[in-house]
Each structure stands twice: as C-alpha cells, then as structure tokens.
C-alpha cells in the first residue's frame, strides 16, 4: 500500500500547503493505519503549537514528532524537545521562536515509535498559519461633534496586519463591521450622542507579509456614549 493524500486545509496556495504520505508496507497491519493530521499554528511569531488528535489512535500511543525545513540551511532533522500531552499521551509539540523560520517550507513528520514504518509527513507554509495576539489599548478620540476615531495597538509589525472593526449601539441587534488596512485606524463619521456605542477589533496576518486565514481573538470591547461621553468630550477609553 502506497498512498499520497492531498487534503485541503484552508490555506491552499498555487501549490498545496500540505500533504500526507504513508510509507509503503508489504502487508496490511498496524502500519497501514493512517496517522492523525498535524495542525500547526504560529502564535504571534513567539511560539508554534503543532497538535494532533491523540484519541484517534486505536490504543493510547505516544507518537513522536520530527521536523525540518525543506531546501534551506535548516534542513537538519530535529526532534521535538517540548511535547504537549493529553491524558499523559503525546498530543502536540511546542516550538520556540528560535526554531521558527516563517518563510521556509516547514516539514513535520509524525511517527509511531513502535511501528517505525508507520509515519506521515506534511509540508506547511508557516506564513499562512500565523495568529497574532488580540489588539490592545483601544482608545477613542472625538474628532468633531459627530465624528469618532478609534485607535489600537498590536504587539506586531503594523504593516503585516489587517483588521476588522465591529461596532454597535445598545439599540442594535447585530454588529456593523468594517475592514481596516495596516494603518490601524478607524473613523466613524456620524455618531448619535444619545446612544451608547461598543467597539471591538481583531487582526489577521494578511496580506503584505503572509496569507493567514485565521483572525486573532477579539480585543476587549471599548464603550462610548450617552452616560459616559459628558465626562470628557475629547477623549474617552472605557474598557468593559
């Protein structure tokens, strides 16, 4: 049995980000059982978690993970040095910043140590798997009688992120949302002074430095409106 499985994972580019290969075997045995898919996410380019569903194994198995970078100076095979566990069984590996090379093709190999021929290899484009921390320090400035400007910070290079701002009043049933580019600034031109507004922001590593599809968590919300804006008409930043 010799299989190559191409599986879309939401990060496809002109070439597949990801493929699985199962080693050929002579007869049907444990070694023909597919290994779980490894999912990796790079958190704020500070560390990376590569995890798999350990409960998909027919019996509890401490799978091992090796990795390397294809066609690069970092192509030496590395062993996972920091395993993550689920119920005392390996279920992931955490790599630190110095082990992350965002713009080189990351190759990750999962193996059953009891059946060394039972292994699966995936290739990942890490620049498509970055998730930044949530935006911080939201502030509101009143630019004019009816215009508000929302600013925020990210613990990240500004020009690498795009943002999504959501806002609503206490009278609204749903959020209004607006995309914002790397300039991380949002203006609301027409504000009703009789209403209380809530704003929140999330960010994504796209499009100038990577093509990640996953957004950060939402920021803490910030409020502006009827019962607060009288205190300081020019600057007010109240976090929930």
């Amino acid at each position: 049995l010799n299989t190559t499985i191409l599986t879309p994972n939401g990060n496809e580019d002109t070439t597949a980000d990801f493929f699985l290969t199962t080693m050929p075997t002579d007869s049907l045995s444990v070694s023909t059982l597919p290994l779980p898919e490894v999912q990796c996410f790079v958190f704020n380019v500070e560390y990376m978690n590569c995890t798999w569903n350990s409960s998909s194994e027919p019996q509890p198995t401490n799978l091992t993970l090796h990795y390397w970078y294809k066609n690069s100076d970092n192509d030496k095979v590395q062993k996972c040095s920091h395993y993550l566990f689920s119920e005392e069984i390996t279920s992931g590996c955490q790599l630190q910043k110095k082990e992350i090379h965002l713009y080189q093709t990351f190759v990750v190999q999962l193996q059953d140590p009891r059946e060394p021929r039972r292994q699966a290899t995936q290739m990942l484009k890490l620049q498509n798997l970055v998730i930044p921390w949530a935006p911080e320090n939201l502030t509101l400035h009143k630019l004019s009688e009816s215009q508000l400007e929302l600013n925020w910070n990210n613990r990240f290079l500004n020009h690498c992120l795009e943002h999504l701002v959501q806002y609503r009043t206490d009278w609204d049933h749903s959020w209004t949302e607006q995309s914002v580019d790397y300039r991380h600034k949002f203006s609301l031109p027409s504000v009703d002074g009789q209403k209380r507004y809530t704003f929140r922001v999330r960010s994504r590593f796209n499009p100038l430095c990577g093509s990640a599809q996953h957004w950060s968590e939402w920021s803490h919300p910030i409020h502006w409106g009827s019962n607060t804006s009288k205190e300081n008409p020019f600057l007010f930043a109240l976090e929930a």
Epitope: L102, Q104, L157, C209
Partner: nanobody
C-alpha cells in the same frame, strides 16, 4: 540592532528611472521582511513595497507595474527599481527591515526628485 544605509536617490525627469539600494548590517536571512516607504513634507510616511523572506512581493497601487522590489542575498542588498517616474513620486524614500513579531528598523532616507 540592524543598521540600514540607502543610496541611489537623485534628480530625474518625468518618465525616467532610478534604482535605490539598501544595505542592511545584518544578513538578509535573519530579516523576515524588507520594505520601502516614502514621505513628502507634511504627510505621513506611506508604504511603497515589501519583500518577504520567501521573495513574495507586494506593491502600493500607485506604483504597481512601475516599481520592482528585489533582494540579492549573496550581496546582502535590497533594491527598488523605479521606472516611468512621475512628479508625484517625489519624496524621501526609506528602507525598512522587520524582524517578526515586532522589531523594526529604518534607514536615514534618500531623496528622489522627479521634475522637468
């Protein structure tokens, strides 16, 4: 700390070309993102072009098709080839180096003047 030195600015007539160069003090392989920005008096610095560690490039709409960002890892240089220059391209051009997640370094800038 990464030091960046730009060169190649100068005066050119509309329709002409210039090539800006940027020499970082660190090896390019240790820098994730290199970019060019520009600034005109009284305005905010604006992004022009970016090249990432896998040689993916991006351009601001007004320069697409006219400007090309590239890098030469052997010479440890980053370039901005500017063709079909317009008076609106007159600005101080800055080289930028980014090391993720948030280290950022700037050159001193080089002046580009496009006029007849």
């Amino acid at each position: 700390e990464v030091q960046l030195v730009e060169s190649g600015g100068g005066w050119v007539q509309p329709g002409g070309s210039l090539r800006l160069s940027c020499s970082p003090s660190e090896r390019l392989s240790s820098i994730d993102i290199m970019g060019w920005y520009r600034q005109t008096p009284g305005k905010e610095r604006e992004w022009v072009a970016t090249i990432t560690g896998d040689d993916t490039t991006h351009y601001e709409n007004s320069v697409k098709g006219r400007f090309t960002i590239s890098r030469d890892t052997a010479k440890n240089m980053v370039y901005l080839q500017m063709n079909s220059l317009e008076p609106e391209d007159t600005a101080v051009y800055y080289c930028n180096a980014g090391i993720l997640p948030r280290e950022e370094y700037w050159g001193q800038g080089t002046l580009v003047t496009v006029s007849s």
